[in-house]
Interface confidence: low
Amino acid sequence: TRDVREPPALKYGIVLDAGSSHTSMFIYKWPADKENDTGIVGQHSSCDVPGGGISSYADNPSGASQSLVGCLEQALQDVPKERHAGTPLYLGATAGMRLLNLTNPEASTSVLMAVTHTLTQYPFDFRGARILSGQEEGVFGWVTANYLLENFIKYGWVGRWFRPRKGTLGAMDLGGASTQITFETTSPAEDRASEVQLHLYGQHYRVYTHSFLCYGRDQVLQRLLASALQTHGFHPCWPRGFSTQVLLGDVYQSPCTMAQRPQNFNSSARVSLSGSSDPHLCRDLVSGLFSFSSCPFSRCSFNGVFQPPVAGNFVAFSAFFYTVDFLRTSMGLPVATLQQLEAAAVNVCNQTWAQLQARVPGQRARLADYCAGAMFVQQLLSRGYGFDERAFGGVIFQKKAADTAVGWALGYMLNLTNLIPADPPGLRKGTDFS
């Protein structure tokens, strides 16, 4: 006989990412004996909750909690039974719930209470359901990306920890209802609300972050739809040959389209809207989402929001990745430069509905919206955030790193479970992201 070394005991953590359009569950794992090492936590499994985001259950809070049951049942299988009681479970809601909380705080509270009631029924260590601020969403996305890519700290060949010289990566997240930009900066932010200071592994990071509510992909599409109805009577970003019935109540129910809402409109009225495949008019429509007329600081991104110049490399994930991936993979268009990205957007916007369907067989959901999405991403990066060709060369569009989805969820769990120490390795003390 010979001795067989047992694999190290694993610990688990669960995060429910309650986004505006859907909820995803992520289960993370890490070796119990290496809790404070970097790059040790990885994704064990994930599950997409069927149906819409929890904010869509404003009129039916119990429906929100019921929708989670399938994924929670999967979690019971994915996490070993003996680990259930010690597995932290978190639910974080983002911009969809932030919007609901602005328009109907009672409904938002009811949804969170219903969800909490269901989550406490499971044998996990439930640690709360809450709405993340835009700042938290941005910062935790940045932490996730840099943790996975081992930018905070590495174990050297000489057998000690060191801080990599390459510096941190900026993070850009395009969700359904908001978009976040976060990056390390050397100078203090002129706007206190846009700065977060972090202590990770004995290093100090000054991070600029801003979340633009109503600038997520879905809300942008709604706003463009409202603008098209208001100014054109046709949709320049939709392909010619594509036509659909638009329910006015759906268009104007979001607080993001409130400014475009007609004085007296029939919410149950349907309007027929057709596409016109007009890239130039589409670009103008998208441009209308950004205001550069005023800036109460030394410099701004858009809408009077302070932003230092973008610096260093960036990872762009979620809908940034899906949009660029569509252009690259489905359309076969190069997007290595800003000029190419703009040309790709124009190319998609020039396609008729028949051409688009022929080019992307297997009828992709929301195919008609890719022109607007591509045009928005291009404008947001170049005009909005101020990426020039050189800076854009440092942007990578990525969905996963180290087999783990890039998003705020991992960073959120790392923070709440104190898996990133504030002090250098050797000292075992937690960190506070407040």
């Epitope: 609300a193 800036c295 109460p296």
Partner: antibody, heavy 125, light 106 residues
Framework: EVQLQQFGAELVKPGTSVKISCKAS????????MDWVKQSHGKSLEWIGD????????TYNQRFKGKATLTVDKSSSTAYMELRSLTSEDTAVYYC??????????????????WGAGTTVTVSS | QIVLTQSPTIMSASLGEEITLTCSAS?????MHWYQQKSGTSPKLLIY???NLASGVPSRFSGSGSGTFYSLTISSVEAEDAADYYC?????????FGGGTKLEIK
């Protein structure tokens, strides 16, 4: 309760300087910029400038550059404004005001959500 | 700098009357704030970003407008509304205030 405490009045001679204070309480002092506003007798309001207490970053209305200097003492949660080379034109009520913000639609809407009671500066020989 | 012109300069209103104060900007601004200043006190935030009522402000106050023209409406004037009202823009540096409208109650 959020409060900005200012002291009543200062009588000063022309050509001299005066330093007026504004003590904040009821909130985290470094979380909000502090602005200063001038109101001459029977007249409107005029923005002088602001200071970010966290980093001592100041922004001034061009009209008050060289006239006003804004500082803070974080340990006592107090903001100061020094006015120099005083003339009768500087006779006015000076208010400190906390800069509130309402982040929405991707914008930050700034406004003055809390005001001090004002300090009356009278410049007279 | 952006000049804000308020009119009228002085307004006299009866109790229960609906009145509108206006503020015109020398060039387009994104939004407007309104402050109320009662005699001998400091200004108080009334309406922020054009139409949002500040905490504790009665619902008889409302604001609207866009571009270069903004207005403040009091739907039913009460005695306690006697004050100076200032509009304030935070769109363009330096931030400026209107000259004010004095509201007197008949």
């Amino acid at each position: 309760e959020v409060q900005l405490q200012q002291f009543g009045a200062e009588l000063v001679k022309p050509g001299t300087s005066v330093k007026i204070s504004c003590k904040a309480s009821g909130y985290t002092f470094t979380d909000y910029n502090m602005d200063w506003v001038k109101q001459s007798h029977g007249k409107s309001l005029e923005w002088i400038g602001d200071i970010n207490p966290n980093y001592d970053i100041t922004t001034y209305n061009q009209r008050f550059k060289g006239k006003a200097t804004l500082t803070v003492d974080k340990s006592s949660s107090t903001a100061y404004m020094e006015l120099r080379s005083l003339t009768s034109e500087d006779t006015a009520v000076y208010y400190c005001a906390r800069r509130g913000f309402f982040p929405y639609y991707g914008n930050s809407y700034y406004y003055f959500d809390v005001w001090g009671a004002g300090t009356t500066v009278t410049v007279s020989s | 700098q952006i000049v804000l012109t308020q009119s009228p300069t002085i307004m006299s209103a009866s109790l229960g009357e609906e009145i509108t104060l206006t503020c015109s900007a020398s060039s387009s601004v994104s939004y407007m704030h309104w402050y109320q200043q009662k005699s001998g006190t400091s200004p108080k935030l009334l309406i922020y970003s054009t139409s949002n009522l500040a905490s504790g402000v009665p619902s008889r106050f409302s604001g609207s407008g866009s571009g270069t023209f903004y207005s403040l409406t009091i739907s039913s004037v009460e005695a306690e509304d006697a004050a100076d009202y200032y509009c304030h823009q935070w769109s363009n540096y330096p931030w400026t205030f209107g000259g004010g409208t004095k509201l007197e109650i008949k």
